[in-house]
């Protein structure tokens, strides 16, 4: 009789999850040679053990301990690009300036970035069919609670000046239910942080609004100086002459408004 | 069987651009990170740089910053490295190549090279 | 970059003899090197990585010590079939950096 099986909203662990990670890890090893003495194996057990035989919906940041512990990595704390709802120009960017880093340009980032992950309570087993959906099911499922662990643990490690780019297409440019509105912006740490800088990001064309003016990063703005945390936003009417002037700054076209 | 095959031997003029292929078969593409390599007439090797074909992420030897281009389709488990600005110089066997996860970051396969070379 | 300085340029050395080829880097690299075998008209082929580990299908009487500067690789007892040039190559850093390698000919 076949054993019944929870069906969860949301969509199955990646197909070749383990396969994925582990080499992933490898793979981050060969590109960044000061990380060579991280044992992916032991990175793939740990990761494995945070929700394999435990109930989906009831994930712990404690169960990821051992894979932060693995994960550790120091990367200069002045140089750390938050983004919401724009990740691919934010890696875009970190790929050109090269000193700067994202959440998924670390090891633990960059073993989950777009994967889906989760077990079944009392069996080893994955589950490929449905994994719990953050809204629908629960918010303690497996992604979720690695995502707000790491994401703290990424703004708690910020100095100096923090930037964090953002979606000017979205209704809610700063959006205080995404990770960076509802994790990183809190976990920033006064004593180190300076200033939070904002680079909103224009996706029109002929778009010449000042979007620092949209109400809702003068929330972000509000909660960040009650946090005691200088803010400062910028526009980036053109991204795609943004990240021209990030490689090549001596272009005569990259002093003026970008 | 794991397999790197590379496109043709190719003739250039000088300050022109040659892109060469290197199709991947026999494993996940994704999963590995892909080297180029280039070797002058009887000359050492020398290593250009790399791509990881999962996100399109590059690095490249200081050397060839401004005229190399690494890319990769992963519908085709294909990486190509693209040389612009030709001089004589540039007159090499180019090869891909990649570790095998389990021997280190040597580089365990090797495409059977791609001759280039650059005339006036 | 890293300095690879390999040792002879070349090396002449009668069948069934043992041959020895060196390998100095411009820094302490650990034991992040590979030695690899080079055939006229063939692509390289991976011997050694690691300093001291043989890759697969590598006969044992190849071998490397070394680590930090100074390595080498022994062939124990030469065979016709390997006459060729051997490489070093650090991946310790990028960019990664190779000898100017060894030609090893018959006596």
């Known amino acids: 009789v076949p054993r019944w099986r929870q069906q969860w909203s949301g969509p199955g662990t990646t197909k070749r999850f383990p396969e994925t990670v582990l080499a992933r890890c490898v793979k981050y090893t060969e590109i960044h040679p000061e990380m060579r003495h991280v044992d992916c194996q032991s990175v793939w057990d740990a990761f494995k053990g945070a929700f394999i035989s435990k109930h989906p919906c009831n994930i712990t940041e404690e169960d990821y301990q051992p894979l932060m512990k693995l994960g550790t990595q120091t990367v200069p704390c002045n140089k750390i690009l938050l983004w919401s709802r724009i990740k691919d120009l934010a890696h875009q960017f970190t790929q050109v300036q090269r000193d700067m880093f994202t959440l998924e340009d670390t090891l633990l980032g960059y073993l989950a970035d777009d994967l889906t992950w989760c077990g079944e309570f009392n069996t080893s087993k994955i589950n490929y069919q449905s994994c719990p959906d953050w809204r629908k099911d629960c918010s303690n499922n497996p992604v979720s609670v690695f995502w707000k662990t790491v994401s703290r643990r990424f703004a708690e490690a910020a100095c100096d000046v923090v930037h964090v780019m953002l979606n000017g297409s979205r209704s809610k440019i700063f959006d205080k239910n995404s990770t960076f509105g509802s994790v990183e912006v809190h976990n920033l740490q006064p004593e180190k942080v300076q200033t939070l800088e904002a680079w909103v990001i224009h996706g029109g064309r002929e778009d010449s609004r000042d979007l620092c003016q949209d109400p809702t990063i003068k929330e972000l703005e509000s909660i960040i100086s009650k946090r005691n945390i200088q803010f400062s936003c910028k526009n980036i009417y053109r991204p795609d002459k943004f990240l021209q002037c990030v490689k090549n700054p001596e272009d005569s076209s990259c002093t003026s408004e970008i | 069987q794991m397999q790197l095959v590379q496109s043709g031997a190719e003739v250039k003029k000088t300050g022109s651009s040659v892109k060469v292929s290197c199709k991947a078969s026999?494993?996940?593409?994704?999963?590995?990170?892909m080297h180029w390599v280039r070797q002058a007439p009887g000359q050492a090797l020398e290593w250009m740089g790399w791509?990881?074909?999962?996100?399109?992420?590059?690095d490249y030897a200081q050397k060839f910053q401004d005229r190399v281009t690494i890319t990769a389709d992963r519908s085709m488990s294909t990486a190509y490295m693209e040389l612009s600005s030709l001089r004589s110089e540039d007159t090499a066997m180019y090869y891909c190549?990649?570790?095998?996860?389990?021997?280190?970051?040597?580089?365990?396969?090797w495409g059977q090279g791609t001759l280039v070379t650059v005339s006036s | 970059e890293i300095v690879m300085t390999q040792s002879p340029a070349t090396l002449s050395v009668s069948p069934g003899e043992r041959a020895t080829l060196s390998c100095r880097a411009s820094?302490?690299?650990?034991?992040?090197l590979a030695w690899y075998q080079q055939k006229p008209g063939q692509a390289p082929r991976l011997l050694i990585y690691?300093?001291?580990s043989l890759a697969d299908g590598i006969p044992a009487r190849f071998s490397g010590s070394g680590s930090g500067t100074e390595f080498t690789l022994t062939i124990s007892s030469l065979q016709s079939e390997d006459f060729a040039v051997y490489y070093c190559?650090?991946?310790?850093?990028?960019?990664?950096?190779f000898g100017q390698g060894t030609k090893l000919e018959i006596k």
């Open positions: 190549a990649r570790s095998a996860h389990t021997t280190g970051f040597g580089f365990a396969y």
């Open positions: 026999g494993y996940t593409f994704t999963d590995y990170i």
């Open positions: 791509i990881d074909p999962e996100y399109g992420r590059t």
């Open positions: 820094e302490d690299i650990y034991s992040n």
């Open positions: 690691d300093a001291n």
């Open positions: 190559q650090q991946y310790n850093n990028y960019p990664y950096t």
